[in-house]
Amino acid sequence: EDNRCASSNAASCARCLALGPECGWCVQEDFISGGSRSERCDIVSNLISKGCSVDSIEYPSVHVIIPTENEINTQVTPGEVSIQLRPGAEANFMLKVHPLKKYPVDLYYLVDVSASMHNNIEKLNSVGNDLSRKMAFFSRDFRLGFGSYVDKTVSPYISIHPERIHNQCSDYNLDCMPPHGYIHVLSLTENITEFEKAVHRQKISGNIDTPEGGFDAMLQAAVCESHIGWRKEAKRLLLVMTDQTSHLALDSKLAGIVVPNDGNCHLKNNVYVKSTTMEHPSLGQLSEKLIDNNINVIFAVQGKQFHWYKDLLPLLPGTIAGEIESKAANLNNLVVEAYQKLISEVKVQVENQVQGIYFNITAICPDGSRKPGMEGCRNVTSNDEVLFNVTVTMKKCDVTGGKNYAIIKPIGFNETAKIHIHRNCSCQCEDNRGPKGKCVDETFLDSKCFQCD
Amino acid sequence: FNLDVDSPAEYSGPEGSYFGFAVDFFVPSASSRMFLLVGAPKANTTQPGIVEGGQVLKCDWSSTRRCQPIEFDATGNRDYAKDDPLEFKSHQWFGASVRSKQDKILACAPLYHWRTEMKQEREPVGTCFLQDGTKTVEYAPCRSQDIDADGQGFCQGGFSIDFTKADRVLLGGPGSFYWQGQLISDQVAEIVSKYDPNVYSIKYNNQLATRTAQAIFDDSYLGYSVAVGDFNGDGIDDFVSGVPRAARTLGMVYIYDGKNMSSLYNFTGEQMAAYFGFSVAATDINGDDYADVFIGAPLFMDRGSDGKLQEVGQVSVSLQRASGDFQTTKLNGFEVFARFGSAIAPLGDLDQDGFNDIAIAAPYGGEDKKGIVYIFNGRSTGLNAVPSQILEGQWAARSMPPSFGYSMKGATDIDKNGYPDLIVGAFGVDRAILYRARPVITVNAGLEVYPS
């Protein structure tokens, strides 16, 4: 049988341990006489049989430590895990995700108010009371907010003719408010009357081309936490109501806008002020910000572009798409159904990836099926618990510096698990043959470190 | 591995002018001097009444390294009637694209607007200027009677440009026909001979142009990027164009016949919103004398080992085969949000091994997002997937990322040492950098043993 520990001629402890998780290094001074130093590297059982005492063998074990005290998480446990890894080794632990029965819900309506949406805007007037009544079954504390968007207010997306720059619809059949990138109209409030008033005041706007600046507005709504009023403890729902596709990051080169979106909040007096100087966010960037900010998106789409958004869903974890009927008649039911679907899906993703550390996560669903962690479980109820079997592997020790923790994040949840990674890449007894000195660390006395007095 | 990174020639332009947004070499036939051409689309000019008209600068590579603006157009806006301008040159982005071929320079302003003659509008038709030796003419093929969004009113002609071997220009206008986009090609000789400063809409007899299609093709952006190469074996350059929003944003690349603008071949991206077709290039990378196609998708997301999507960018390498079809491989970027594939520059045979090489930029990669350019070598099987050299941007961000590598041009030996050189633009810090290739020394070691 192949023994890579003994056959690889490892001349130092660190090199020996890097060969594989089964390798050990004997530090006993009298272990070899006249032989090669590499004989010190072997499988532990071989080292013992060759006369190395057990406490003289460098063989860092894999530890998974889950602190039991100070657990503050209620939905994602454990909230913290410490793992000691050595090259080639893997550690295992279970993560539990337990959805609550009723969440507080923050629902922010982000509405495309371009001219083609004229039919759907009217329906918003009757959203408030009906929706809050329906949501009372699923939420213990429901709040609504509202914002509008059109597109970047530059050529070629809007007409820059002086007579039309503030009313794209002059010369048309519509009365339109000035075009805008994104306006935050109403912060999240439990005052439904206030919401209905804000919606009732909303006028249609307009631009020239078909795609709109939805991703710009979504990113701002996600990251401008204090402006919107997103609560930490609430399920955060961003409802994007539109009938057209969205502009992509690099579309704005047509307008001479070539500075990548910085992903930060840029609202001044509730208006997105960097709309005309920064690109639309890319899908990857938008996805990252939505997940970071625990935002679940509901695309409520009227017309044939519904399928465009539906096809985007695999690229935007934690999003859902529903089709609005003519004049948005089914809008409230769509929201309720989407919310039920979103809270019944539990999937996780690894954030803050640590270089050289690999995660393999398998979801064990309430029905007993197993799925990849990113796919997760569907149809989870508040009585259910989803288990995630997490395997953490460190392939080799060639990474220096960088982050020493990763985060496992259930998508749309406001709790995470922090995984501290300790790399056992060096030996407690290094191979320096210098003059003996006192051992600094009292835990490794001369029984192990033969250099010590 | 043989680009000299220790002593590149650095050129800088006016701050905030986006100097370096477009770059090319300029090797006039009559002169022994050689130049760099650098677009600065937000530069202020001496044109009366014009704000940020944009300019193209000519930089002497050898001695002074000074850059002088080329005067293509010294005039302000022409008037249709009193207090009614015919055109709007402020913020027109002149210099957003620039290409040269021998004595010819074509430079464009894709955000040039005009009022139209029929009704008072303000439409971004785009315009270009062509300099051929001492003669400078305007070339605005989208400034036509076919106005409005459903015509050529929003064409933005000159958004992308190239020259063919046979002295045609190829121009991309991504906004024609409700942003279906359009390719237009005209003969240099006819552009020059037909020019009349008093005629706003010039008709060219030998023009090749794509036409409007059904509305389902709206918002595709044909003409966003262009390149040329022979793809049907007739010895005439065909037209390659990125169409990044086509196929419901999967993105496509179309190849049209350079003789008659008929469709030859299409490539389709595999992921929505990856911006497949943002950049295109054509060069024979595997030494079989067939031009190969390189397509950038800078927003492509790759699924990592943990299943998480990460935006790394991707370049598709499609090798043209004798049978006329293509064999495609994919090359993913190395860093998240670096936008690998934003620019692709054929380099010629950089290391003189008989195979052409290529540069691929990730303008937001590297330390502090300073930008990275990867050099990949060609070989008989295609592209070597491991970069042979990595050029790193050395300039810290000012008010925006440096964007080192956003524009690149290679395949020209400016220092006449037999090895082609590379220009890299970094418009965010108003720089253009010339990397010269050093000769490759091949050492042949031999051992002869003479038994006694």
Epitope: S116, N173, D175, N207 | Y178
Partner: antibody, heavy 127, light 107 residues
Framework: EVQLVESGGGLVQPGGSLRLSCAAS????????MSWVRQAPGKGLEWVSA????????YYADSVKGRFTISRDNSKNTLYLQMNSLRAEDTAVYYC????????????????????WGQGTLVTVSS | DIQMTQSPSSLSASVGDRVTITCRAS??????LAWYQQKPGKAPKLLIY???SLQSGVPSRFSGSGSGTDFTLTISSLQPEDFATYYC?????????FGQGTKVEIK
């Protein structure tokens, strides 16, 4: 069902005035631009005037500019055409029509297409 | 103003015939053209808009084509209820203008 009913037509002397009304029902009146189109006896159709949904923008044919005024009362779902300084050539059947909000290729709807028309009211200008 | 010219000004046809009416604009109007049908003593009825889009509720035997300056209305198989006057109208720019009409009569 969309209904448009014109009234106010009749015989008037040259130089006189008349006010036409159009009562609308079956749709959200304030969301639609409205037009007046006329047809002289035995002749073709001629567009006269139009008004946007809120009443903020008005448009007139050169032949009636300065003499006719279009207005609307959205609370009453009614469109008006005040006709002053009437001439013999203004004799026609006057139709009130709803401007359709039909999709175009871009964001803005099509202009000046009328999808519903009233039955018309006859205005005769004669001495 | 843009002038619209229809031809012929009248035509006679039988039930089942294929009928074609043309309309020419004095300048390019892209595809911004509508067709209306009017029966004696009645209000006009919208048939086609944007040159070729069929208004909902209009039978599919009606079709429109053309772009720029030349447009066509085709009735693929004339029915008894189709005998009427047909008007084209440009909806490209203000003021919208109509053609003089084409009367389709029973042969």
């Amino acid at each position: 069902e969309v209904q448009l009913v014109e009234s106010g037509g009749g015989l008037v002397q040259p130089g006189g005035s008349l006010r036409l009304s159009c009562a609308a029902s079956g749709f959200t009146f304030s969301s639609y631009a409205m037009s007046w189109v006329r047809q002289a006896p035995g002749k073709g159709l001629e567009w006269v005037s139009a008004i946007s949904g809120s009443g903020g923008s008005t448009y007139y044919a050169d032949s009636v500019k300065g003499r006719f005024t279009i207005s609307r009362d959205n609370s009453k779902n009614t469109l008006y055409l005040q006709m002053n300084s009437l001439r013999a050539e203004d004799t026609a059947v006057y139709y009130c029509a709803r401007s359709a909000l039909l999709p175009s290729r871009g964001d803005l709807p099509l202009r000046w297409v009328s999808d519903y028309w009233g039955q018309g009211t006859l205005v005769t200008v004669s001495s | 103003d843009i002038q619209m010219t229809q031809s012929p000004s009248s035509l006679s046809a039988s039930v089942g015939d294929r009928v074609t009416i043309t309309c020419r604009a004095s300048q390019g109007i892209s595809s911004y053209l509508a067709w209306y049908q009017q029966k004696p003593g009645k209000a006009p009825k919208l048939l086609i808009y944007a040159a070729s889009s069929l208004q909902s509720g209009v039978p599919s035997r009606f079709s429109g084509s053309g772009s720029g300056t030349d447009f066509t209305l085709t009735i693929s198989s004339l029915q008894p209820e189709d005998f009427a006057t047909y008007y084209c109208q440009q909806h490209y720019t203000t003021p919208p203008t109509f053609g003089q009409g084409t009367k389709v009569e029973i042969k």
